[in-house]
């Protein structure tokens, strides 16, 4: 089968644009989720974010992030997640392993899961963009 040249497929300006878009969408998601009052962040959930042993953008745990956001989409019909998933798919290899998420069953715990992961996703995209831009600066020096 015709394999596509990976380097050719992802110029850094495209990757930066994808991550910028994800950062913006993550803020929209968080703003939407935070409108639910009386919900506290939980220590029980951790969204994988950046891998220390890979170069940007492959250091972003995109498949795992996608799985967590897909779970939120199933728990609470946030349409912005559809667009987030489409952009994450630009960073995910077709043969990336699947990530299984254990979903809370209690209604209030679901709300805590959604808030916690949304908050971590927003922070993660800030970090991802920083790692991209610092990586780009290092590459030019």
């Amino acid at each position: 089968s015709h394999t596509l040249p990976v380097r050719l497929l992802r110029p850094s300006d495209d990757v930066q644009k994808i991550v910028e878009e994800l950062q913006s969408l993550s803020k929209m998601l968080l703003k939407d989720v935070e409108e639910e009052k009386g919900v506290l962040v939980s220590q029980n959930y951790t969204l994988p974010c950046l891998s220390p042993d890979a170069q940007p953008p492959n250091n972003i745990h995109s498949p795992a992030i996608r799985a967590y956001l897909k779970t939120i989409r199933q728990l609470d019909n946030k349409s912005v997640i559809d667009e987030i998933i489409e952009h994450l798919d630009k960073l995910i290899f077709q043969d990336a392993p699947e990530t299984n998420i254990s979903v809370p069953t209690d209604t209030h715990e679901c709300k805590r899961f959604i808030l916690t992961i949304s908050q971590q996703f927003s922070e993660c995209m800030d970090l991802a963009l920083k790692s991209l831009t610092s990586g780009a600066q290092q590459a030019t020096t």
Partner: antibody, heavy 122, light 107 residues
């Protein structure tokens, strides 16, 4: 060799529904989006919607929302596009298409079905 | 939805001519653009993906380029077998809309 084989031509009455199938062979990846496109006689290509077969996640064109349903059966590697409340303007060739890798998101649709002609006539 | 404005809608050129077809996106879509060729009564065929990468088996006379939100398909030396309608399609976010098409004929 990757192949997409679509179901045969259909003649339908206005108000009825049509379900077109698209069977993929020679493709082992699960993370990809496939699309459905139609082309009315003498007209251009029109995007109808897409499905991520691994999860059954769908996206639809606003124009067809509520009338089109795209599904996939992972066990048979077959995708389906059902269009309801048919009218004469739905007379067209319907295509399924999907991309080559390496990423889950498409950059272009490398593989196309042969097309299914749907004629809507009373 | 992102609009793809394709021009011209039709053109007539001589064999050997250089032909250019343009698609303008209504917003920045990066390199997420493909070009297809469709001959009369045939299935669309991918020519260029990711704005400028040639699909397998596509003659070298076909090339794609990008300048901002403007995307160009160039046929460096038009051949009789290039008579077809050409379409662009973006893949930035759904809906993945197509341009209106450009019908290429031989003078």
């Amino acid at each position: 060799q990757v192949q997409l084989v679509q179901s045969g031509a259909e003649v339908k009455k206005p108000g009825s529904s049509v379900k077109v199938s698209c069977k993929a062979s020679g493709y082992t990846r699960t993370r990809y989006w496939m699309q459905w496109v139609r082309q009315a006689p003498g007209q251009g290509l029109e995007w109808m919607g897409a499905i991520y077969p691994g999860e059954g996640d769908t996206r639809y064109s606003q124009k067809f929302k509520g009338r089109v349903t795209i599904t996939a059966d992972k066990s048979t590697s077959t995708a389906y596009m059902e269009l309801s409340s048919l009218r004469s303007e739905d007379t067209a060739v319907y295509y399924c298409a999907f991309p080559e890798g390496p990423y889950a998101a498409p950059y272009g649709m490398h593989y196309w079905g042969q097309g299914t002609t749907v004629t809507v006539s009373s | 939805a992102i609009q793809m404005t394709q021009s011209p809608s039709s053109l007539s050129a001589s064999v050997g001519d250089r032909v250019t077809i343009t698609c303008r996106a209504s917003r920045n879509i990066g390199n997420y653009l493909a070009w297809y060729q469709q001959k009369p009564g045939k299935v669309p065929k991918l020519l260029i993906y990711y704005a400028k990468t040639s699909a397998e088996g596509v003659p070298s006379r076909f090339s794609g380029s990008r300048s901002g939100t403007d995307y160009t398909l160039t046929i460096s030396s038009l051949q009789p077998e290039d008579v077809a309608t050409y379409y662009c399609q973006h893949f930035w976010k759904t809906p993945w809309t197509f341009g209106g098409g450009t019908k290429v004929e031989i003078k």
